[in-house]
C-alpha cells in the first residue's frame, strides 16, 4: 500500500499575488488525523511555506501568522498561499502524512509551479 | 549548525527502567519528526520510536509498545525515551536522529548512548 | 511491515574499484522513500542519498543511488580508503521504518 499525493502541474498567481491549488492524496488507511505541509523548492533550495494538521471532517487550520489557508474534503486539500511576489516564483510541493492511527504514512506530489507577476504600478493621472 | 547529544546510559537490571535524554541544538524540535534509533553490539540498526511535530502523536516500534515512552520538553530543545521493564534484547547504542525535510530518513544523529540490560 | 534484504553481505574490493550493493523490499517502497547510510566502526550512521537517488548535503557525487519499486542500489564509483565501511538502505514511506541488514565493505 502506497500513498499517492497530486497536484495541479502549474499555477498562475493572481494580480494580488493569491494563488490556489488542490492537493489531493490516495489514502491507504483510515487516518483520522492528517498533516499538510507545503515547501517551496527554487534553486535547489528548499523552504518549509507552511503546514497545518487536521482532524479528518474538520477544517484545516493553519497558524496565524501564515501565509496559508485552506478547506478540507475528504482525501482533498484546497490551499491558499497569498502575499506572493514576483521572486517568490518556484516550485511549491505539497507533503502529506497520515499521523493517526498507525501505521503513519507519508506522500509527496511532484510540485505546483507557481509563477508570480508583479503588477505594474499605476500610472499617475493628470486629473 | 545542527548538534544532537545523547545521555543517560549505562549498566541496568532487567525489568528495571532508565531514561535517556537528547538534548538539540541548532534548530527547533517542533519543526521536525524526532526519532530514537538502536543498534546491538555487532549488529544492524533498528528504528525505536518517532515523536511527530507538536508532541501529541508517537509511533513506536512493537518491540518497545507498552514499555518504552516517548516526551519532549520544548523549553530545553529535549528529547526523552523513558524506557520501562527492560530486557536482555534492549542492550544496544541509544541514537537520537532528526527526521529529514522529505520524510522519515535520518540527516543528523547523535553520538550515541550506550544501554546495557544485564543481571 | 516492509522487510528489506542486502546483497551482497560482505563486498571485497580495491580502492579505486567500483562498489555496486543492492537493496531489495518485501514490497514496493512508495515514491522511491529511500535512503542509504555510511557507518564507520564507533561513529554514528551518516546519511548519503534519500528519495533513492538524491544526494545528502556535503556528500561526494562518487556516491549515486538509483531504483524505484523494490529494487534500489547505491553505487560508488571509485572507492576511496575512507569508504570502507558499511552500508545500511532504509524505507521511510511507511511506519515502522525499517532498515536492511547492511552491506559490509572491506579491502581486498
Known amino acids: 500500500k502506497a500513498m499517492h499525493v497530486a497536484q495541479p502541474a502549474v499555477v498562475l498567481a493572481s494580480s494580488r499575488g493569491i494563488a490556489s491549488f488542490v492537493c489531493e492524496y490516495a489514502s491507504p488507511g483510515k487516518a483520522t488525523e492528517v498533516r499538510v505541509t507545503v515547501l517551496r523548492q527554487a534553486d535547489s533550495q528548499v523552504t518549509e511555506v507552511c503546514a497545518a494538521t487536521y482532524m479528518m471532517g474538520n477544517e484545516l487550520t493553519f497558524l496565524d501568522d501564515s501565509i496559508c489557508t485552506g478547506t478540507s474534503s475528504g482525501n482533498q486539500v484546497n490551499l491558499t498561499i497569498q502575499g506572493l511576489r514576483a521572486m517568490d516564483t518556484g516550485l511549491y510541493i505539497c507533503k502529506v502524512e497520515l499521523m493517526y492511527p498507525p501505521p503513519y504514512y507519508l506522500g509527496i506530489g511532484n510540485g505546483t509551479q507557481i509563477y508570480v507577476i508583479d503588477p505594474e504600478p499605476c500610472p499617475d493621472s493628470d486629473f | 549548525q545542527v548538534q544532537l547529544v545523547e545521555s543517560g546510559g549505562g549498566v541496568v537490571q532487567p525489568g528495571r527502567s532508565l531514561r535517556l535524554s537528547c538534548a538539540a541544538s541548532?534548530?527547533?524540535?517542533?519543526?521536525?519528526?524526532m526519532h530514537w534509533v538502536r543498534q546491538a553490539p555487532g549488529k544492524g540498526l533498528e528504528w525505536v520510536a518517532v515523536?511527530?511535530?507538536?508532541?501529541?502523536?508517537?509511533h513506536y516500534a512493537d518491540s518497545v509498545e507498552g514499555r518504552f515512552t516517548l516526551s519532549r520538553d520544548n523549553s530545553k530543545n529535549t528529547l526523552y525515551l523513558q524506557m520501562n521493564s527492560l530486557r536482555a534484547e534492549d542492550t544496544a547504542v541509544y541514537y537520537c536522529?532528526?527526521?529529514?525535510?522529505?520524510?522519515?530518513?535520518?540527516?543528523?544523529w547523535g553520538q550515541g548512548t550506550l544501554v546495557t540490560v544485564s543481571s | 511491515e516492509i522487510v528489506l534484504t542486502q546483497s551482497p553481505g560482505t563486498l571485497s574490493l580495491s580502492p579505486g574499484e567500483r562498489a555496486t550493493l543492492s537493496c531489495r523490499a518485501s514490497?514496493?517502497?512508495?515514491?522511491?522513500?529511500l535512503a542509504w547510510y555510511q557507518q564507520k566502526p564507533g561513529q554514528a550512521p551518516r546519511l548519503l542519498i534519500y528519495?533513492?537517488?538524491s544526494r545528502a548535503t556535503g556528500i561526494p557525487d562518487r556516491f549515486s543511488g538509483s531504483g524505484s519499486g523494490t529494487d534500489f542500489t547505491l553505487t560508488i564509483s571509485r572507492l576511496e580508503p575512507e569508504d570502507f565501511a558499511v552500508y545500511y538502505c532504509?524505507?521511510?514511506?511507511?511506519?515502522?521504518?525499517?532498515f536492511g541488514p547492511g552491506t559490509k565493505v572491506d579491502i581486498k
Open positions: 536522529a532528526r527526521g529529514g525535510v522529505w520524510g522519515s530518513y535520518f540527516d543528523y
Open positions: 541548532g534548530f527547533t524540535l517542533s519543526n521536525y519528526g
Open positions: 515523536i511527530w511535530y507538536d508532541g501529541r502523536n508517537k
Open positions: 514490497q514496493s517502497v512508495s515514491s522511491s522513500y
Open positions: 528519495g533513492a537517488s
Open positions: 532504509q524505507q521511510y514511506g511507511r511506519s515502522p521504518f525499517t
